[in-house]
């Protein structure tokens, strides 16, 4: 039975040209995290595999950085980066958990950031 829950940064906003950290945290389960996939709508951004480390998709190599932790840092943001992002936790023996983050990239220099989420 899947007992875990994913906490995410939720809805966040950031300024064009700036950077943002996407963060998820899996709790309430003892399942082993084998891999975390980060996806933007239907595009793979990055994979963090427990044994193999990080793979950043070629399309995003120049402006996506791994971490902190299992999170992902998006840099040089453009308005086209606005949209849904998913953290997909592959675990054993539970299976797959998915978290959702909505990022809005604003032209304005007064972008209000959502509450920063931090893994304890």
């Amino acid at each position: 039975m899947m007992t875990g829950t994913i906490e995410t940064t939720g809805n966040i906003s950031a300024e064009k040209g700036g950077s943002i950290i996407l963060q998820c945290h899996l709790s309430s389960t003892t399942a082993q995290v084998t891999q975390v996939n980060w996806e933007q709508q239907d595009q793979l951004l990055a994979i963090c595999n427990a044994d193999l480390g990080w793979h950043i998709s070629p399309s995003f190599k120049d402006r996506v950085a791994p971490g902190p932790g299992l999170g992902l840092t998006l840099q040089s943001l453009t308005v086209n980066d606005t949209g849904e992002y998913f953290c997909i936790y592959h675990t054993y023996p539970d299976g797959t958990y998915t978290g959702r983050i909505f990022l809005e990239v604003l032209e304005s220099s007064v972008a209000e950031h959502g509450a920063r989420f931090q893994i304890p």
């Epitope: 084998t34 996939n37 996806e39 239907d42 595009q43 994979i47 480390g53 793979h55 998709s57």
Partner: antibody, heavy 121, light 107 residues
Amino acid sequence: QVQLQESGPGLVKPSETLSLTCTVSGYSITSDYAWIWIRQPPGKGLEWIGYITSSGSTYYNPSLKSRVTFSVDTSKNQFSLKLSSVTAADTATYYCARLDFGNYGGAMDYWGQGTLVTVSS
Amino acid sequence: DIQMTQSPSSLSASVGDRVTITCKASQHVSTALAWYQQKPGKAPKLLIYSASYLQSGVPSRFSGSRSGTDFTLTISSLQPEDFATYYCQQHYITPYTFGQGTKLEIK
């Protein structure tokens, strides 16, 4: 230039253990890569057996997990496969390969030439 | 495990033809798909990774694309050395799995 070379007996009896070694040249096996075993029965498709990292972390395909063991010998720049309780269904060409996860994800960029192992009494 | 289904299983074509091979994943694999070429008695050779990225040294007549869980390998103008068997492989999640192969033969 990275080169991989499989070696081991070409004939194994049913119920025995198949043992193969892959020798890597032109690159240190201790580098940040995973080392893969894949097999291909005659005239058939490819089956991914699993990986071992230089630190000894392993992943085995669940279909073979109960019978397979990988090991790595960094001093000889080699990694090895053992498959126990073999049957005729294990007859295949066995390939070793390199997985450069950082650059290619789970795609294998360098392969050995393969070695045919026949299971027969 | 994720099942990969290639079509057609075999294909006859002539030098200069444009050829398309398709691969369908049984579930979401995003862009984590590779294509390999294998000639008789040889090891597979990586052609394309991450659905559309050409491996270094591979001729530009090879290209890859994706639509949902459907993937396509296109050879824009077949050359004599392209007659071989082609395999797709998902590299989204372990165990990585291959399609059953498409044998490209001379017409």
